[in-house]
Amino acid sequence: EVEKTACPSGKKAREIDESLIFYKKWELEACVDAALLATQMDRVNAIPFTYEQLDVLKHKLDELYPQGYPESVIQHLGYLFLKMSPEDIRKWNVTSLETLKALLEVNKGHEMSPQVATLIDRFVKGRGQLDKDTLDTLTAFYPGYLCSLSPEELSSVPPSSIWAVRPQDLDTCDPRQLDVLYPKARLAFQNMNGSEYFVKIQSFLGGAPTEDLKALSQQNVSMDLATFMKLRTDAVLPLTVAEVQKLLGPHVEGLKAEERHRPVRDWILRQRQDDLDTLGLGLQGGIPNGYLVLDLSMQEALS
C-alpha cells in the first residue's frame, strides 16, 4: 500500500503524458487523478512506464472502479492488461470484439495466460455462444484455442462458425473433441461439391463414423495417410479392403509403413489375408484363408 503523501507544488498532472515516467512511485500516487487517468487511458499504452509505475496506475483504477472497470477503460488498457489478475477480469463485462482484440494483441506471441483464458471465458459466456467472428479472432491469436475447450463447451459452437476453423486449429484436438466438431462441419459444408467438400472436411474426419468413410470411398478423394491414421479405430475396422483402397487411392501404398500402428494394425487383423494380398503390399496378419469369422458383437445384439 502506497502512503498517501501530498503532491509537490507544480507537479499535479494536467494530462497523461510522457513527463509522468520521471515521477517516482509516491509522486504518481499523489499527483495523478484517477478520473483523469480513466478518461485518458488510450495514452498510457504509448508511454514506456515500468512495471512499478503500472502498478500505481492500476491501483488508482481499482480505487475508482471497485466493482470492475467499464469497457471504455478496458478497451484502452494496453500493457496495463498484463498487470490484471483473473480475479480482476472476472469483474468485467466485455461485449465488444474490438476490446477483446485489443487485449489479445497485448499478449500476442506469448502462451495463453490465466488472464487471457479468463478474459475469453467472460467474453464467450457473455455472448452465449462461440460465433464465427469470435472464433476467427481467437484462433488467429491462439491456433490451439478450439482444442483447449471441453466437448461440452464445443457443443455451443454453431455450425456456421466452423468456416473460421483452419486445419492447424485442430492439430491438438483429441477424438472426443472431433466427435463433437465433425457433425457440425458436415452440416456447415454440406452444400459443397465432392472435391471441395473433402478439402474442407478432411481436418475433422477424426470424428467421422464408418458410414461417412464408406461414402467418401465412393468419391475418389485420395485421402493421405496422415489423415487416415487420425481416423477413429472403431470407424475404420468395418471398412473392406476395397473401400480402404478406394479411400486412399494412390496413397494406399503407405499402409505398409504403418502396418504396426493403429488403426492400420487393428484393421489388418479384421481382414481376410487373401483380400489383403490383392493390394500387393505384403501386408501380413490377416485372417487365414478358410477360417470362419464370427461377429460376436452382432450375435449379442440379435439375442
Partner: antibody, heavy 119, light 110 residues
C-alpha cells in the same frame, strides 16, 4: 546475425572524457530500451543506466551526471559519453538490450569493451 | 532504494550436486527478477526471467522460484559447464536504484 558490438575503449587519463559506442546488427535498436552495465576487474556487475524507446534516460544513483546515454537510430547505435573519469571507472563496459520498452531483463549483451583509467 | 542482496557470495560444489543460490530485494519486486550466468572473460547470459521462466536454449536443470522479496536459483544437477558466477537483477523499477544487480555468487569446483 543478431549481435551488439561495443567499441571505443582503451587507456585514458584521469579527468578526461571518452565515448563508447554499441553498434547493433540484426535488430532495430529503436524498438527496445537499451542499457549500459560495467564490471570492474574481479568485481560484480554494476548497472549504469537505461534509455527507453522514447529516448528517456534513467541512471543509477551513483552516476551523478558524469555519464550520458544517447542513441542514433539512423545508425542503429547506442552511445555512452563518460566525463571526469577516475581510476575506479576502470572496467569492462557492456551494452545490453532490455526485453521491454522501458525496463526489464537484459536478453542480449555485447562482448564488452575495456576502459582503463590511468595516468 | 531498491537493493539486491545475493547469498552466498561463493560456494564449492561437485558435479551432480544440487545447488541453490538466493537473492533478496529490499522491497517487493513481485516476480520481476532475472538470473544471469557469467563465465570468465565472457559477457553475462540470461538464464531466467520473471523469476521462473527459462530463457531460450537454457537447460531444464536450471530453475527459478520466488516472488516479492525472496528468490531462488536452483541447479538440480551441477554439470562441468555450470561452474561460473551467477547474478540476479530486478526488472521492476529503474528509479531509486543504486545497482539493479545482486553482488554475484561464484560457483567453484570442490
Amino acid at each position: 546475425q543478431v549481435q551488439l558490438v561495443e567499441s571505443g575503449g582503451g587507456v585514458v587519463q584521469p579527468g578526461r572524457s571518452l565515448r563508447l559506442s554499441c553498434a547493433a546488427s540484426g535488430i532495430d535498436l529503436s524498438s527496445y530500451a537499451m542499457s549500459w552495465v560495467r564490471q570492474a576487474p574481479g568485481k560484480g556487475l554494476e548497472w549504469i543506466g537505461v534509455i527507453d524507446i522514447s529516448g528517456n534516460r534513467f541512471y543509477a544513483d551513483w552516476v551523478k551526471g558524469r555519464f550520458t546515454i544517447s542513441r542514433d537510430n539512423s545508425k542503429n547505435t547506442l552511445y555512452l559519453q563518460m566525463s571526469s573519469l577516475r581510476a575506479e571507472d576502470t572496467a569492462v563496459y557492456y551494452c545490453a538490450r532490455v526485453d521491454s520498452r522501458a525496463w526489464g531483463p537484459f536478453n542480449l549483451w555485447g562482448q564488452g569493451t575495456l576502459v582503463t583509467v590511468s595516468s | 532504494d531498491y537493493q539486491m542482496t545475493q547469498s552466498p557470495s561463493s560456494l564449492s560444489a561437485s558435479v551432480g550436486d544440487r545447488v541453490t543460490i538466493t537473492c533478496q530485494a529490499s522491497q517487493s519486486i513481485f516476480s520481476y527478477l532475472a538470473w544471469y550466468q557469467q563465465k570468465p572473460g565472457k559477457a553475462p547470459k540470461l538464464l531466467i526471467y520473471d523469476a521462473s521462466d527459462l530463457a531460450s536454449g537454457v537447460p531444464s536443470r536450471f530453475s527459478g522460484s520466488g516472488s516479492g522479496t525472496d528468490f531462488t536459483l536452483t541447479i538440480s544437477s551441477l554439470q562441468p559447464e555450470d561452474f561460473a558466477t551467477y547474478y540476479c537483477q530486478q526488472g521492476y523499477t529503474r528509479s531509486d536504484v543504486d545497482n539493479a544487480f545482486g553482488g554475484g555468487t561464484k560457483v567453484e569446483i570442490k
